[in-house]
C-alpha cells in the first residue's frame, strides 16, 4: 500500500477499515470501486458489487470524495450521495449528500470535487454505496475519487 | 491549544496526531506549516521542512484544507495535493488530490476551499507533504488552510 | 439510528461522539441542530442551544458540512465557521472556516456545499458551534447539513 508492502498487522491492529479508489469501468449506479490494487485498504469489512458490507455493529467514520469534470460546461446538476441499504429495511437511506448547481462558466472546460465525511452508527449487514448523478462526468483517478470508512 | 493551555497528557493519550496551520512565508513547494503557535498539535509525529514524518507504521487518517482566493478571477487551474515521499521509493506518491477549473466569474473577487481526507497505511519514515498549483492564491489563515493526521 | 434501532452499547463503547443534523427552525446564529430524531448520534457529549459541550478533555476530530443554495444567484459572500467558546476566555475562537465568493452565475438557481474537518485538543466545558453568513441560503436536510465530532 502506498508504494510499499503493507506490514504484517499486529494482532490488535485488525482495524475495521476500508479505502477504495475510483474504477473507470463503472457503468451504472452504484459506483464500483477498486478493491485490490494501488493505495487500497480493505480489512474487517467486505466489498461486494460497489458496496462496503459492515460485519460488526458500531460507530464508523465514513467518507467519500468524487471528482467531476467536463470538456464543456453546461451546468448539469451534480449530486454525490453515500447511502445505506439493509435487507431488513425497504428503502435506501441517504447518509450524506452533496449537490452542485451553477458551478462553472458555460462552454468552458471545468473541474470540481465533492467531499463528504461523518460518523454513523452502523449495524452488521449494512451495505454502504456511493451514487452520482452524472457518471460520464466523473474522473476515476485513485487520488481524486474514493470511498472509505473506519470503525472508531 | 485552542485558546487554553494543553492539559498534561495522560500516559495512554500519547496519540500520534498532528494539526498544522497555514504559514504565509511559504515561498515554494511543498507548502510550509506553522508547527508551534496557535491551534497547532504535534505529538508522536515530526515536522520537517514542510513534511509530517511518520515514525510508527500503521493506519492514519490524513486531511488537508486549502483556501484559495484572488482579487480578480482569471480561472487559473487550481490543484491541491497530499503526497508521500519515502527514501526507499524513487517517486512521490499522490495520496489525495483536488482540482478546480472554471470556478469563478472573470474579473470578480473570488474565494474557494479544497478539502481532502482519507485513511492510509503509512510506514515509518514516510514523509507527507501538501502541494498547491498557485501559491500566490492561497490564504494562510490558521482556520482556513491546514494539514493534519492522526493514527487510528 | 440510520433506519434501525441503535444496538445496546457495550460497556467499552461509550465513545464520546456526536452527529447532529440540520434543523430548519434555526432563526439566528449559531445554527441549531436536530439532536434526537433521524441519523443523529449523541453520546458522552451534551447538546445545548446550538452547541456541543465537551465534558472530557482530550483530542477530538470535529467536522461540519453546510449546504447552501438559492433561487437566483447574486454571489453573496458565504462563510461557514466552526468556533469554540469557553467561559474562561473572552473571545470566540474560530477553529475552522470556509468562505466562498463568486461561486455561481448571476440569476441562476445554484447549490454548493462547504465541508470542514480537523483534529483539536478540547477541554472540558468547551462549547462548539457552527456559524454561517447567510441563514436564508442554508438547506437543512439531514444528509446535507450536519455537525459532529468524536474523541480519538
Amino acid at each position: 500500500q502506498i508504494g510499499h508492502p503493507s506490514p504484517p498487522p499486529e494482532k490488535k491492529e485488525l482495524r475495521k477499515v476500508a479505502h477504495l479508489t475510483g474504477k473507470s469501468n463503472s457503468r451504472s449506479m452504484p459506483l464500483e470501486w477498486e478493491d485490490t490494487y494501488g493505495i487500497v485498504l480493505l480489512s474487517g469489512v467486505k466489498y461486494k458489487k460497489g458496496g462496503l458490507v459492515i460485519n460488526e455493529t458500531g460507530l464508523y467514520f465514513v467518507y467519500s470524495k468524487v471528482y467531476f469534470r467536463g470538456q464543456s460546461c453546461n451546468n448539469l446538476p451534480l449530486s454525490h450521495k453515500v447511502y445505506m441499504r439493509n435487507s431488513k429495511y425497504p428503502q435506501d437511506l441517504v447518509m450524506m449528500e452533496g449537490k452542485m448547481m451553477s458551478y462553472c462558466t458555460t462552454g468552458q472546460m471545468w473541474a470540481r470535487s465533492s467531499y463528504l465525511g461523518a460518523v454513523f452508527n452502523l449495524t452488521s449487514a449494512d451495505h454502504l454505496y456511493v451514487n452520482v448523478s452524472e457518471l460520464s462526468l466523473v474522473n476515476f483517478e485513485e487520488s481524486q475519487t474514493f470511498f472509505g470508512l473506519y470503525k472508531l | 491549544q485552542i485558546g487554553h493551555p494543553s492539559p498534561p497528557p495522560e500516559k495512554k493519550e500519547l496519540r500520534k496526531v498532528a494539526h498544522l496551520t497555514g504559514k504565509s512565508n511559504s515561498r515554494s513547494m511543498p507548502l510550509e506549516w506553522e508547527d508551534t503557535y496557535g491551534i497547532v498539535l504535534l505529538s508522536g509525529v515530526k515536522y520537517k521542512k514542510g513534511g509530517l514524518v511518520i515514525n510508527e507504521t500503521g493506519l492514519y487518517f490524513v486531511y488537508s484544507k486549502v483556501y484559495f482566493r484572488g482579487q480578480s478571477c482569471n480561472n487559473l487551474p487550481l490543484s491541491h495535493k497530499v503526497y508521500m515521499r519515502n527514501s526507499k521509493y524513487p517517486q512521490d506518491l499522490v495520496m489525495m488530490e483536488g482540482k478546480m477549473m472554471s470556478y469563478c466569474t472573470t474579473g470578480q473577487m473570488w474565494a474557494r476551499s479544497s478539502y481532502l481526507g482519507a485513511v492510509f497505511n503509512l510506514t515509518s519514515a514516510d514523509h507527507l507533504y501538501v502541494n498547491v498549483s498557485e501559491l500566490s492564491l492561497v490564504n494562510f489563515e490558521e482556520s482556513q488552510t491546514f494539514f493534519g493526521l492522526y493514527k487510528l | 439510528q440510520i433506519g434501525h434501532p441503535s444496538p445496546p452499547p457495550e460497556k467499552k463503547e461509550l465513545r464520546k461522539v456526536a452527529h447532529l443534523t440540520g434543523k430548519s427552525n434555526s432563526r439566528s446564529m449559531p445554527l441549531e441542530w436536530e439532536d434526537t430524531y433521524g441519523i443523529v448520534l449523541l453520546s458522552g457529549v451534551k447538546y445545548k442551544k446550538g452547541g456541543l459541550v465537551i465534558n472530557e478533555t482530550g483530542l477530538y476530530f470535529v467536522y461540519s458540512k453546510v449546504y447552501f443554495r438559492g433561487q437566483s444567484c447574486n454571489n453573496l459572500p458565504l462563510s461557514h465557521k466552526v468556533y469554540m467558546r469557553n467561559s474562561k476566555y473572552p473571545q470566540d475562537l474560530v477553529m475552522m472556516e470556509g468562505k466562498m465568493m463568486s461561486y455561481c452565475t448571476t440569476g441562476q438557481m445554484w447549490a454548493r456545499s462547504s465541508y470542514l474537518g480537523a483534529v483539536f485538543n478540547l477541554t472540558s466545558a468547551d462549547h462548539l458551534y457552527v456559524n454561517v453568513s447567510e441563514l436564508s441560503l442554508v438547506n437543512f436536510e439531514e444528509s446535507q447539513t450536519f455537525f459532529g465530532l468524536y474523541k480519538l
Partner: antibody, heavy 119, light 106 residues
C-alpha cells in the same frame, strides 16, 4: 445616503509615514469591499489597494506593495491606509471607494484627502 | 497588465452635441468595463458598468457600448453639467484606468 469621508492627509517628508482614515456611513460597511484609489496632481486615476468585506484579504498595486497596509475596523465603520517609506511619487489625492458586489469597480467615492510628500 | 487607452485626450463640443469617447484595451476584457465622470476638485462619479449598463440615477443621455477591446461612451445631447473629465476602467484582470478624456466647451 452613502457617505465616505477621508482624513489624515498632509505634508510629509520622504521616508516618513502617514495614516489615512475613511469613515463610512449610510450603508452596512461590514458587507462591502473598500478600495483606495489615488490621483497625482493633474494626472489620471491609479488603483492602490483593496480590503475584503470582513478584512480577511488584502491586495495591493505593485507600486505600493510592502510599503502600504490597508486595514479596517468594522465595529467603527472605518477604513485605514498606513503608508510607510513615503516617496515623492506617492504625492496624490487619496480616495476611498466602495466596491460594487465584489466586482472591482466603484459605485461611491469619498471626497479625497491630499498627501504631499516633499522635503 | 492590461493597458487602457482613451481617445481623444481632449474633446471640444457644444451644448446639444452628440459626443463619443473611445476606450481601447490592450487585450480582450470581454464586457468588464466601467465609466466615471470627474469634475475639477471633485471625486469621480460612477456612470456605467459592464460596458453598457447604466447606473441608476444616471441620465439616459449617457450610454455605453462595445466588447472585447473597443468601447465607447456616448452622450446623446450634451448638457452644461456634462463638461468634465471621463475615465474608463477595466476590471477583467485586476484594475486599470484609462488616462482620461477632458470634455470642454467649444
Amino acid at each position: 445616503q452613502v457617505q465616505l469621508v477621508e482624513s489624515g492627509g498632509g505634508v510629509v517628508q520622504p521616508g516618513r509615514s502617514l495614516r489615512l482614515s475613511c469613515a463610512a456611513s449610510g450603508f452596512t460597511f461590514s458587507t462591502y469591499g473598500i478600495h483606495w484609489v489615488r490621483q497625482a496632481p493633474g494626472k489620471g486615476l491609479e488603483w492602490v489597494a483593496v480590503i475584503w468585506y470582513d478584512g480577511s484579504d488584502k491586495f495591493y498595486a505593485d507600486s505600493v506593495k510592502g510599503r502600504f497596509t490597508i486595514s479596517r475596523d468594522n465595529s467603527k465603520d472605518t477604513l485605514y491606509l498606513e503608508m510607510n517609506s513615503l516617496r515623492a511619487e506617492d504625492t496624490a489625492m487619496y480616495y476611498c471607494a466602495r466596491d460594487r458586489d465584489n466586482w472591482n469597480y466603484f459605485d461611491y467615492w469619498g471626497q479625497g484627502t491630499l498627501v504631499t510628500v516633499s522635503s | 497588465d492590461i493597458q487602457m487607452t482613451q481617445s481623444p485626450s481632449t474633446l471640444s463640443a457644444s451644448v446639444g452635441d452628440r459626443v463619443t469617447i473611445t476606450c481601447r484595451a490592450s487585450q480582450s476584457i470581454s464586457s468588464w468595463l466601467a465609466w466615471y465622470q470627474q469634475k475639477p476638485g471633485k471625486a469621480p462619479k460612477f456612470l456605467i458598468y459592464q460596458a453598457s449598463s447604466l447606473e441608476s440615477g444616471v441620465p439616459s443621455r449617457f450610454s455605453g457600448s462595445g466588447s472585447g477591446t473597443e468601447f465607447t461612451l456616448t452622450i446623446s445631447s450634451l448638457q452644461p453639467d456634462d463638461f468634465a473629465t471621463y475615465y474608463c476602467q477595466q476590471y477583467n484582470s485586476y484594475i486599470t484606468f484609462g488616462q482620461g478624456t477632458r470634455l470642454e466647451i467649444k
